[in-house]
Every structure is written in structure tokens, then in C-alpha cells.
């Protein structure tokens, strides 16, 4: 089942997706599409990378993170209710049926009358505590034990740090992937 992410109308939505590139070597092509991941490729492609660059994108969709290190998280600018739905992040690992597929559900809420602080409103909001580590092989995924309790202050700090890509970079440098949604 999809992990759910939330954003408000008019704000930016953030859909996290990470992988650990082989080192040294080329990046793995990635595609983002609107709709659940099909058997191959992405349906309704909104953004695509190749071994080096973002080589296709549509307006409002971009990669805010250090994508050449594997942070291929999608930012959708100025979201509307029509942006709600399932998005597919597909890591196109060479070889037959090696792709890693992630379906992420985006829920857009009407804008609140009273605005929240900007940095936290820009960041999608729900926080299930799930941390996985990924080795260099495409199939090597293990789930760690439960994380320590995180209070609300730590959550907002974590969101800010991740949005700034610093924590995300540190985690990937140690071979970890974090999903916050």
C-alpha cells in the first residue's frame, strides 16, 4: 500500500524517493509519473533523469535535492486539488525486472485560513516513523528496529533539516534511506 503524504493548496508538496548510486559510476535513470507504477516505465511522466541530468520535466515539477547523489525526491510547486493522487517513483536499475518502484499517495487539503509557519507549510506533513537501509545491490533492503520516540519539536526540526537536504545527504552517505510522510 502507498505511503500517504499531505500538502495544502498553494504550497509545495514533497514526495521523497532515494536510492544509493553505485560508486564510482553513472547515475541510474529515474522517472516520476502520475498514477501507480505500471509494469514498465512510468505512466504520465512528469519528470525524468538520465545518467547525468534531469532531461525531461513539466512545469511545477522539479528535484530539489542532490539528485546526483540519489535524492530524487519530487517537489510539486503551488499544488492544487487536482494534484491529489498516486505518484510513481521508478529507479530504473539495469537488468530485467530490477527496477525499484515506489507508489506515493499525495493528498491535497484546502488551504487553512490561519497560515502555519512557512518552512513547515512548504513541507509535506505526516510522519510515520519508518527507516530502511539499502545496500548497493538493488534487492538488498532491510528494516531497522523501531526508532526512538520523537517529540513534536524534533519532528519539525527533522522536517526542516530534511527539506534542506542536509539530513537526507547524511543518511544516504551512511547507506540509509528515510521516508517521512
Amino acid at each position: 500500500s502507498e505511503v500517504e503524504y499531505r500538502a495544502e493548496v498553494g504550497q509545495n508538496a514533497y514526495l521523497p524517493c532515494f536510492y544509493t548510486p553505485a560508486a564510482p559510476g553513472n547515475l541510474v535513470p529515474v522517472c516520476w509519473g502520475k498514477g501507480a507504477c505500471p509494469v514498465f516505465e512510468c505512466g504520465n511522466v512528469v519528470l525524468r533523469t538520465d545518467e547525468r541530468d534531469v532531461n525531461y520535466w513539466t512545469s511545477r515539477y522539479w528535484l530539489n535535492g542532490d539528485f546526483r547523489k540519489g535524492d530524487v525526491s519530487l517537489t510539486i510547486e503551488n499544488v492544487t486539488l487536482a494534484d491529489s493522487g498516486i505518484y510513481c517513483c521508478r529507479i530504473q536499475i539495469p537488468g530485467i525486472m530490477n527496477d525499484e518502484k515506489f507508489n506515493l499517495k499525495l493528498v491535497i487539503k484546502p488551504a487553512k485560513v490561519t497560515p502555519a509557519p512557512t518552512r513547515q507549510r512548504d513541507f509535506t506533513a505526516a510522519f510515520p516513523r519508518m527507516l530502511t537501509t539499502r545496500g548497493h545491490g538493488p534487492a538488498e533492503t532491510q528494516t531497522l528496529g523501531s526508532l526512538p520516540d520523537i517529540n513534536l519539536t524534533q519532528i519539525s526540526t527533522l522536517a526542516n533539516e530534511l527539506r534542506d537536504s542536509r539530513l537526507a545527504n547524511d543518511l544516504r552517505d551512511s547507506g540509509a534511506t528515510i521516508r517521512i510522510g
Epitope: 534531469v54 542532490d66 540519489g70
Partner: antibody, heavy 126, light 108 residues
Framework: EVQLVQSGAEVKKPGASVKVSCKAS????????MHWVRQAPGQGLEWMGW????????KYSQKFQGRVTITRDTSASTAYMELSSLRSEDTAVYYC???????????????????WGQGTMVTVSS | GIVLTQSPGTLSLSPGERATLSCRAS???????LAWYQQKPGQAPRLLIC???SRATGIPDRFSGSGSGTDFTLTISRLEPEDFAVYYC?????????FGGGTKVEIK
């Protein structure tokens, strides 16, 4: 010392082709991308394309697609840029510039064009 | 491709003064992969800043870069005589890679 040394100036007639070379030294040639950038007299910089010196993959700016070919000779640590069907507006200084093969696990994921060749003046005139 | 607009076109300042150069992108720059280069007449460009804010090797700390998304700034805290040159911004995350039109920093 890390450096890129380019071939000498060229004068070509419209419709001809030109091939500019860029010899790398002081670093592992195959661990970097090589880009080509041109600059018309008194104008700004224009990216033409890249080659991954490790695997030979290339990418070209759509503006030059079909006219430009970037190749490399790993044994000579040299990259080449050939531009065909030359016209007067191709008169420019042509630069090669290197850029890391990524990913890198510490620091930023990219270092941009950190070393440039000295430039090769290509004049297209009848 | 992404269009980079630099302003001002020319900046007339005296040595010791602070220079602030702007680079605005038509769309968000992926990964904040934005670089700044300095070019002097008859020379190749020289990398100053990469990743929007990281100084390249050997670049004096009077040069600093900031910004993200669509708005980026290069600041030279105190201009030295050798800093008078043309400065270009470049995005290198989305193909085609593009350069701004340049800002000339000249002696007042």
C-alpha cells in the same frame, strides 16, 4: 598539474567541418565528463554537449544536434569535438571543460566545470 | 531549457566596495546545481562557486554564493583590483545546461 590543452586556431570555409582536440593531463581522464562550450566574439557562453570519458556516452544540446560529434580516445586522454556544416555564426572560441563522474559520497553531488582548456579560436569565413 | 537572467548588466564599483550580482532562473534549478564563473578578457572562465554556495578550490573567501530555487546571488565582500571581470551564472542540472548573459564588474 591538472590541465586541459587544446589544439590551435582554425580557419574554415562555410560548409566545412572542424575538429578540435582537448588533451587532459594530471588526473584520471576516465573519471570525468568532458564538456564543450563555445563563446562567439563579445558574446556569452553556450554549452554544446558532454561526453562521459569513462563509457563514451554523449549528450548534445538540441541546438547542435546532428552537427556536433564529441568523441574521446582514452589511451591518449584526449577528447574531440567535431562541428560540421560550418557557417559564419559558428565563429567562436571553443572550450573544453571537465566535470566529475558522479556520484560522490561526501560533499555536494557535483563540482561543475572546474578546469577549462585555454580555448580554440575557430573562424568561419569565405 | 532554463533561461538564466543576470542583473545588473554592468556594475560600476570601486576597489574595497561590496558587489552583489543576481541570477534569476525561469524555472527552479534542479538540485540547486548552479555555478558562478569569472572571466577576464582573453582567458577561459574560472569556476568560483558550485552547488549555489560552495566555493571552488582556491577561491578566496570574499566570494560567496547564496540562494536556491530560482533566485541566486554572488557576493564579493570587498572588491580587489583583480576582481574586475565578467561573471556568469550557469545551471548544470537540467539539459541543456545554460549560462546567464553575464554581469560586467567594472572600475568606477
Amino acid at each position: 598539474e591538472v590541465q586541459l590543452v587544446q589544439s590551435g586556431a582554425e580557419v574554415k570555409k562555410p560548409g566545412a567541418s572542424v575538429k578540435v582536440s582537448c588533451k587532459a593531463s594530471g588526473y584520471t581522464f576516465t573519471s570525468y565528463y568532458m564538456h564543450w562550450v563555445r563563446q562567439a566574439p563579445g558574446q556569452g557562453l553556450e554549452w554544446m554537449g558532454w561526453i562521459n570519458a569513462g563509457n563514451g556516452n554523449t549528450k548534445y544540446s538540441q541546438k547542435f544536434q546532428g552537427r556536433v560529434t564529441i568523441t574521446r580516445d582514452t589511451s591518449a586522454s584526449t577528447a574531440y569535438m567535431e562541428l560540421s556544416s560550418l557557417r559564419s555564426e559558428d565563429t567562436a572560441v571553443y572550450y573544453c571543460a571537465r566535470d566529475h563522474v558522479l556520484p560522490l559520497y561526501y560533499g555536494s553531488g557535483s563540482y561543475a566545470f572546474d578546469i577549462w582548456g585555454q580555448g580554440t579560436m575557430v573562424t568561419v569565413s569565405s | 531549457g532554463i533561461v538564466l537572467t543576470q542583473s545588473p548588466g554592468t556594475l560600476s564599483l570601486s576597489p574595497g566596495e561590496r558587489a552583489t550580482l543576481s541570477c534569476r532562473a525561469s524555472q527552479s534549478v534542479s538540485g540547486d546545481y548552479l555555478a558562478w564563473y569569472q572571466q577576464k578578457p582573453g582567458q577561459a572562465p574560472r569556476l568560483l562557486i558550485c552547488g549555489a554556495s560552495s566555493r571552488a578550490t582556491g577561491i578566496p573567501d570574499r566570494f560567496s554564493g547564496s540562494g536556491s530555487g530560482t533566485d541566486f546571488t554572488l557576493t564579493i565582500s570587498r572588491l580587489e583590483p583583480e576582481d574586475f571581470a565578467v561573471y556568469y551564472c550557469q545551471q548544470y542540472g537540467s539539459s541543456p545546461y545554460t549560462f546567464g548573459g553575464g554581469t560586467k564588474v567594472e572600475i568606477k
